[in-house]
């Protein structure tokens, strides 16, 4: 099934201290989905959706192991056929810089 | 219909600390579409921003209050928290807590409650 | 921190009149703005996201423009209602800040 879109959302950080915030959203035919964000590989946290959004904003303590840095991946899981649970392919990667350049 | 409510005394003492309690009522702290913040407003001035906590415990506060801000939340009690730490007579003020809505690259603070006004005296 | 600041700070209006309120951010935000009505001794309450996104039960009477640094909160025909202070607030990046405020009083 179709790769989720990642992305950096505001509020952006300023200094290592504050959270980050990715954004993780499954296309318009799966809402409610299980989301998990990675980490170079390793899972940094799991959301499920709300069964009526089809995405979900992850949001990282600044100052930890788990921020800043990347690079991020996303990837949901949704019941198929059977209720047997497929996995999206991943997301495109994201990285995160402080502070987050202006527009 | 959510519902906010802070609780907290009404007069600390000059250099003791400012404890906020916000419960609320009509909804989960615990939604993946929801933060918790702290907005004050000193007597005839404007908002200022203190900080938001998420369900998860994950922060952030405003870094002109150094570090003298300590949120917490309680999943169990529905409820989260402030703490102010060697207060002065400049964090007089009403405090309000508020919930935040999140969704993808919105972020607004949606419910309010109140406001207590907190006065720094000895 | 990015600074808001509003323009004017206070204006005189008559029921009726279109008014037109400016918050300056001092650098690009993009659209991630915010706008607040304040009523005195009440808490302040959301009129407006993403600068120009009507929050779900404000009047259409109300309506907000801008992107980058440069934002107008409008009401098109002010009521008695409308008397109030409305604030701007930035959510580009950390820490949240808000705008000075804007009192619109009756003339």
């Known amino acids: 099934i179709p790769a989720p879109s990642i992305r950096l959302v505001p509020p952006y950080p300023s200094s290592q201290e504050d959270p980050i915030h990715i954004a993780c959203m499954a296309p318009g035919n799966f809402p409610g989905a299980n989301f998990t964000l990675y980490r170079g590989g390793q899972v940094v946290q799991l959301l499920q959706a709300p069964t009526d959004q089809r995405g979900v904003t992850f949001n990282l303590s600044g100052g930890s192991s788990k921020a800043p840095g990347g690079p991020f991946h996303c990837q949901y899981g949704v019941l198929g056929e059977l209720n047997q649970s497929q996995l999206s392919d991943l997301s495109e990667p994201v990285n995160v810089s402080f502070p987050v350049p202006t527009w | 219909q959510v519902q906010l409510q802070e609780s907290g005394p009404g007069l600390v003492t000059p250099s003791e600390t400012l404890s906020l309690t916000c419960t609320v009522s009509g909804g989960s702290i615990s939604s993946v579409s929801y933060y918790w913040g702290w907005v004050r407003q000193p007597p005839g001035k404007g908002l200022e921003w203190i900080g938001s906590i998420y369900y998860s415990g994950t922060t952030a506060h405003n870094p002109s209050l150094k570090s003298r801000v300590t949120m917490a939340v309680d999943t169990s009690k529905n409820q989260f928290s402030l703490s102010l730490s060697s207060v002065t007579a400049a964090d007089t003020a009403v405090y309000f807590c508020?919930?935040?809505?999140?969704?993808?690259?919105?972020?607004?603070?949606?419910?309010w409650g109140q406001g207590t006004l907190v006065t720094v005296s000895s | 921190a990015i600074r808001m600041t509003q323009s004017p700070s206070s204006l005189s209006a008559s029921v009726g009149d279109r008014v037109t309120i400016t918050c300056q951010a001092s650098q690009d935000i993009s659209n991630y703005l915010n706008w607040y009505q304040q009523k005195p001794g009440k808490a302040p309450k959301s009129l407006i996201y993403a600068a120009s996104s009507l929050q779900s039960g404000v009047p259409s009477k109300f309506s907000g423009s801008g992107s980058g640094t440069d934002f107008t909160l409008t009401i098109s025909s002010l009521q008695p209602e409308d008397f109030a202070t409305y604030y701007c607030q930035q959510y580009y990046s950390y820490p949240l800040t808000f705008g000075g405020g804007t009192k619109v009083e009756i003339k």
């Open positions: 508020a919930r935040g809505w999140r969704y993808y690259e919105d972020y607004y603070f949606d419910h």
